[in-house]
Each structure stands twice: as C-alpha cells, then as structure tokens.
C-alpha cells in the first residue's frame, strides 16, 4: 500500500501518502442569480458556475444545487469573495429612537450543512456596515480559513442581499475549497 | 521513480508522490514603484522584491520583470494584498447628469499571461469605491484563490493607480503563489 | 526513513515524503478579551479559543499564552480575520493644526517572535482608516500569506484597539496556520 515502504527483510508502516494531484478541489465562479424564495431569517445561498471559464471541480469534489459536496474527510481550506454593489444616499436613513442609527450592511457567510445535524454551522462570516454618501458604491468581502470536514458535508455561500451581488465577472465573486 | 514502492518480489505503481518541500513557491513584497509609461486602458503592473526580508522564491518559481513564472503545471493558490492610501476631500466630485455620481475607486487585479493567448486572463479582482470625506485615507484589498496553471504561465498584479500604492512596508503590500 | 524506498538489490533516496494528515495545523477562534496591560508603542495581542467549536490544534502545533508555537521548520500559510466594531460620529474629530486631519484607524498585525531575535517581525499588516459618519460601524480585516518559519517560532495577532474587536462569534474573528 502507499505509505508502506519495504526493505529486504522487514516492513515499516507509515501514515498514508497520497499524490497531491488527486485531492478534491473546486473553484466556483459567479453567475447571475435568479430570484428565489428562501427561508425567513436565513440568508439566501448563491449558486455558481462549476465548469466554464476559470471554474472547475475535480477529484470527486462535486457541485450541485448551490452546494459543494465534500467527498473525503480531512482538513480543507475554504475561501470566498463576494463583490457587492449598490446605491446609498444617506448613512443615517434608518433612525431608531434612543440609540445610534442602525447602518445598512452587507454580509457573506460560508455555511456547512451536515445531514445528521439539524442546524447548519456558520464557518466564516464577513460583515460590513455600508455608509457611502451620495454615490454608487462597490466593495468586496473576502473570507478564507481551514476547517476539518467530514465526508458528506456540504458547503454553501450565503449573502445578506442577493440583489447587491456583483455577478458581472468571474474574478470578482467566487468560492472555492481544497483538501490540504 | 517517486511513487513507486518496491517489495522484494513485485512492484506496485501509484500516482506520483512528491515531497512538499520541493514545490514551487514564492512570496514577494512591495518596493517603491518608479513612474513608468503603461499602455492606455491597461492597469499598470507592480514590480516586487523577491529576495530581501520576508520575500523569497524557491523550487524553480522565478520572478522577472514584474512577473512570477510558473515552472510546472498544476493547481496553485495565488494571493495578494495591496494597501492603498490617498487624499479625497469629496465623494461626489464627478457629477454625471441623470445618474448617481461615479465614485473614485481602487482596484487590484491578479492577471495570468499565457504566451500562446493573445489576451491576458484576469484571475482575481478586488475593486472598491472610495468615499472618504476630508481626510487622508488608507485601506487594503486582499485577494486569494486556487487556479489551474500551466508551465510557462506568468502572473502579475495590476492596480488602478500605481501612485496610491503604499510601498512603505513589506507586510502591507505583497503577492504570492504556491503549488498545492 | 520515509522517502527512502527499497528495491531488492539497491536503495534509492528521495526528498522526504510525508502524509498530509500529520502536518502541524491550527485554527483558533475569538474569545472575549480581558483587558490587560501591554507595552507602550506595541499593539496588544489577542488570545484565542483553541479547542471548542470550530477551533483546533493538531500534530504538535500548540497554542499557549496568545501564541501559536511552530513545531517544525517549513513553509506555512498563515491567516487571520479580525472583525472590528465601533461608533464614530465624525471623520475629522482629531484636528491637527497645519496638516490634514488624522483619521481614526483599525489595524491587525500578524507577528512572529523568534527567541533568538530581540525584535518581533511583522509578517502581515492590514490597516484601514475609519470614517463612518453618525452611526455604529463594523468591518473585517482579512490577512493571509505564506512564510518560511523555523521550529520554535511563535505567532500572535496584534490589534490597534482590543476594545473594538468583535468577540461575539467564532466565524467573525479567527487565526490559523498550516504547514504546506
């Protein structure tokens, strides 16, 4: 077996070795989102391009129905960037009596769904107040970190407002993961 | 060959194994940019430190003339941060009739050049409107993702305005890539 | 030894191979910070959760007293996100005669301490002016890059103002590293 190296008169066993080229990997890129219903109090999930242009999945890492499917347990580096764009005419539009104004905001969450768990797990969140006076605005939120995942886990990217996502270029909004 | 493990009486062949320590890797750090002419409608490319301080290239990953040269086909994680700084006294300087003001902006692009392709490929873009009233401002844009690259590909970092790049510290503005 | 593969009549020596699963790795998550004294002119270091929830350390990568301890020399990818939150009523509060207003700012630094060096080394810095008029604000700073580290090096995350760090969720503020 890989990881067993044989000498003429004895055998030594090591942790399994594997070729880097056969590890599960994916880089997904933005597509225009179709408005869809989503659960109240849950941010909508983005769907992605997985084959065209810069996008790919390989080595049993599959994409289906907004989810990346984890084919093998291990430690994965997971990342996403979402570029938002919008128009805000005032920072202090939402006045709330007795406390400071609640700012507009943009949020990205990378979420793990495990079928045996009732609740999704938020792995990464990037959240930012938006206060741009009198002009169009645009800005990215980038996230990336390492997590221990189990075979069968599913990953998705949720955003606070799907209508603000910049879907115009594959290099602006993307999502990926690879086994370390 | 690496990846072939020998037993006394037979040979088993596996996908190629390789030591992690001999994979192509680079981390480049900022140096002051000298003003140079660049093509109209193309963002200027940054040049980098590749040897001093925190910067290094190893295992045939070479840096030359603003480009990282990819020595071996495979999946690479590529990243960059550019810290920008500037002075802006108004967000809405550029008024355009009939639509909201066009904001000032800062943009970073990681670009791949393949000699057999006539056009460079934009791998990653971070772009942000800048609206800072009445003070000097500074902020980073961070990018990172995984891409399948071919031997001979070249990578560079382009910015919207080279005169706004903070070149004062190697930890503020950097560019790197490593074979997974 | 791993990396030495034996045939019946001769021995071939290769660069050492090792299983990916036994490489030093850590992902640390935010906990509420207790106010502590720190050296003047040095940003305070954050302390972290290393076992509960999404946090883990493995394969001799240990966390102690705000530091990640590097157990083995090699190239590491190091990352952190810190989410800040605060309240700013004016961008130009700090007026300074004879020059533009000094903006408020938020800064994250990933620092390496080597016992044989008198001074810590700043590996990564994310620094941003904050100018949010008349509202609460919140925003993340993300950093990540690859560095060559030595056994015994220690890593920490320093911030400009510990009281502005959002410690409310493990997905908002985190710190990690893994051997490549």
């Amino acid at each position: 077996l890989k990881g067993q190296e044989f000498a003429p008169s004895h055998q030594q066993v090591y942790a399994p070795l594997r070729a880097d080229g056969d590890k599960p990997r994916a880089h997904l890129t933005v597509v225009r989102q179709t408005p869809t219903q989503h659960f109240k109090n849950q941010f909508p999930a983005l769907h992605w391009e997985h084959e065209l242009g810069l996008a790919f999945t390989k080595n049993r890492m599959n994409y289906t129905n907004k989810f990346l499917l984890i084919p093998e347990s291990g430690d994965y580096f997971i990342y996403s960037q979402v570029t938002f764009r919008g128009m805000t005419s005032e920072c202090s539009e939402i006045r709330q009596a007795g406390r400071p104004n609640k700012p507009d905001s943009i949020t990205v969450v990378i979420t793990k769904v495990t079928d045996s768990y009732p609740e999704p797990t938020q792995l990464l969140m990037g959240t930012k107040s938006v206060c741009e006076v009198g002009s169009n605005w645009f800005q990215p939120i980038y996230l990336g970190a390492m997590f221990s995942l189990q075979e069968g886990d599913k990953l998705m990217v949720n955003v606070s407002d799907i209508s603000l996502v910049d879907y115009t270029a594959e290099d602006k909004t993307f999502f990926g993961a690879f086994l370390l | 060959l690496k990846g072939q493990e020998f037993a006394p009486s037979h040979q088993q062949v596996y996908a190629p194994l390789r030591a992690d320590g001999d994979k192509p890797r680079a981390h480049l750090t900022v140096v002051r940019q000298t003003p140079t002419q660049h093509f109209k409608n193309q963002f200027p490319a940054l040049h980098w430190e590749h040897e001093l301080g925190l910067a290094f290239t190893k295992n045939r990953m070479n840096y030359t003339n603003k480009f990282l040269l990819i020595p071996e086909s495979g999946d690479y994680f590529i990243y960059s941060q550019v810290t920008f700084r500037g002075m802006t006294s108004e967000c809405s300087e550029i008024r355009q009739a009939g639509r909201p003001n066009k904001p000032d902006s800062i943009t970073v692009v990681i670009t791949k050049v393949t000699d057999s392709y006539p056009e460079p490929t934009q791998l990653l873009m971070g772009t942000k409107s800048v609206c800072e009233v009445g003070s000097n401002w500074f902020q980073p844009i961070y990018l990172g993702a995984m891409f399948s690259l071919q031997e001979g590909d070249k990578l560079m970092v382009n910015v919207s305005d080279i005169s706004l790049v903070d070149y004062t510290a190697e930890d503020k503005t950097f560019f790197g890539a490593f074979l997974l | 030894l791993k990396g030495q593969e034996f045939a019946p009549s001769h021995q071939q020596v290769y660069a050492p191979l090792r299983a990916d699963g036994d490489k030093p790795r850590a992902h640390l998550t935010v906990v509420r910070q207790t106010p502590t004294q720190h050296f003047k002119n040095q940003f305070p270091a954050l302390h972290w959760e290393h076992e509960l929830g999404l946090a883990f350390t493995k394969n001799r990568m240990n966390y102690t007293n705000k530091f990640l301890l590097i157990p083995e020399s090699g190239d590491y990818f190091i990352y952190s996100q810190v989410t800040f939150r605060g309240m700013t009523s004016e961008c130009s509060e700090i007026r300074q005669a004879g020059r533009p207003n000094k903006p408020d700012s938020i800064t994250v630094v990933i620092t390496k301490v080597t016992d044989s060096y008198p001074e810590p080394t700043q590996l990564l810095m994310g620094t941003k002016s904050v100018c949010e008029v008349g509202s609460n604000w919140f925003q993340p700073i993300y950093l990540g890059a690859m560095f060559s580290l030595q056994e015994g090096d220690k890593l920490m995350v320093n911030v400009s103002d510990i009281s502005l760090v959002d410690y409310t969720a493990e997905d908002k503020t985190f710190f990690g590293a893994f051997l490549l």
């Epitope: - | 002051r32 000298t34 003003p35 660049h38 700084r85 500037g86 305005d161 005169s163 790049v165 | 020059r99």
Partner: antibody
Framework: ELQLQESGPGLVKPSETLSLTCAVS????????WAWIRQPPGKGLEWIGD???????NYNPSLKSRVTVSIDTSKNQFSLKLSSVTAADTAVYFC???????????WGQGTLVTVSS | DIQLTQSPGTLSLSPGERATLSCRAS??????LAWYQQKPGQAPRLLIY???KRATGIPDRFSGSGSGTDFTLTISRLEPEDFAVYYC?????????FGQGTKVEIK
C-alpha cells in the same frame, strides 16, 4: 503638527559642495518618502531627488552625478549634498513630503542658497 | 524627459471671474498630473492630484480635468487669495517634471 525645516549655509562658493538638512517633526518618519525640490529665482520648480527611511533613493538623472541624499532616522532628518556647484545652482531649496507617491503634499518654507565667490 | 507646457504664461482677471489654465504634456501621462499654487515668498501648495482629485482642505472652486496629454485647472470664481502662480507636475514617468507656471494676476 507636521513641520519641515530646511537649514544650511546660504552662500556656497563655486566648485564646492552645497549641504542642506531638513528636520521633520510631527509625523511618522518611516511612512513616507522625503524629497528635495529647488526653484531658481524667478523660475520654475525642479525635482532633485528623494529618500525613504531605509535609505532608498531616487534622483533626477540631470543631477544624479552630483547629488547625494541621505537620511538620519535617529534624528528624523534627511540631507542634500550637491557637489561642484555653479551659479546655475543658485535657488531656493525646498524639502517636502512625498504623499501618496510622487506628489508633494507638504513643504518646508524653503531656504535660498546663493552660489558666488 | 516629459516636458510640460503651461498656457497662458499670464492670465489677467478680476475677482469673481472664472480662470482656466492649461497644461500640455509632451507624451501621455495618463491621469498622473498634479497642480500646485505658489504665492510670493511661500512654498507651493498642492491643489489637485490624479488630474481631478482635490487635495485635502482645497475649496471646491478648484477643479481639475483631463487625461493623456491635455489637462485643465479651473477656478470657478476667483477669490482675492487665488491670485498666484500655478504649476502643473507630471508623475507618469521618471523623472518627475514641472511646467514653467502660469501667473494669475489681478486685472
């Protein structure tokens, strides 16, 4: 408050070396490049060169063979030396902060140096 | 070296009038152009950078425009303190160079 203050002799003999110092206060010295610019009486501005806290310099090629800009970070000051001066080097010499890059957003008040025997 | 040519050499106007100053580069400098104001016996003061971005604290009656080789500084309504010499500076190529200046004087 950021202040830049040039100092040095106001009169230099032809063929000698002009030496000026600029003292900086009120700002982090290491965050910027620091420049020298000159202006002959009644004429326009000419960039001489600049330096950062690590001692990295950029010079105007027209003056490069005669110019040395140096820095003393312990004193928060930087200096200009211009060798083999002639009457054509008579000018007001300004030190300035370069921010964000290649733009001079804050200047000293200038010092007149006359080259004459 | 890139040469910058400013015109006119002198502009005679009254307070309240509009001033339009021109700067032409010998080759393209993109938008890497700055404008400075200098009064007698004083150091220059940065007004505009990036061809059109006002520096901190500069009144909005000052505006810059242009790209490539042709640039304009406009003072929409001259105030008494605006009478001075104005210089353009390019930073699109090394060495950095300045124009010869335009004097705005009271008519």
């Amino acid at each position: 408050e950021l202040q830049l203050q040039e100092s040095g002799p106001g009169l230099v003999k032809p063929s000698e070396t002009l030496s000026l110092t600029c003292a900086v206060s009120g700002v982090s010295f290491s965050d910027y490049h620091w420049a020298w610019i000159r202006q002959p009486p009644g004429k326009g501005l000419e960039w001489i060169g600049d330096i950062n806290h690590r001692g990295h310099t950029n010079y105007n090629p027209s003056l490069k063979s005669r110019v040395t800009v140096s820095i003393d970070t312990s004193k928060n000051q930087f200096s200009l030396k211009l060798s083999s001066v002639t009457a054509a080097d008579t000018a007001v010499y300004f030190c300035a902060r370069d921010f964000p890059n290649f733009i001079f957003d804050f200047w000293g008040q200038g010092t007149l140096v006359t080259v004459s025997s | 070296d890139i040469q910058l040519t400013q015109s006119p050499g002198t502009l005679s106007l009254s307070p309240g009038e509009r001033a339009t100053l021109s700067c032409r580069a010998s080759q393209s400098v993109s938008t890497y152009l700055a404008w400075y104001q200098q009064k007698p016996g004083q150091a220059p003061r940065l007004l505009i950078y990036g061809a059109s971005k006002r520096a901190t604290g500069i009144p909005d009656r000052f505006s810059g425009s242009g790209s490539g080789t042709d640039f304009t500084l406009t003072i929409s309504r001259l105030e008494p303190e605006d009478f001075a010499v104005y210089y353009c500076q390019q930073y699109g190529d090394s060495p950095l160079t300045f124009g010869q200046g335009t004097k705005v004087e009271i008519k």
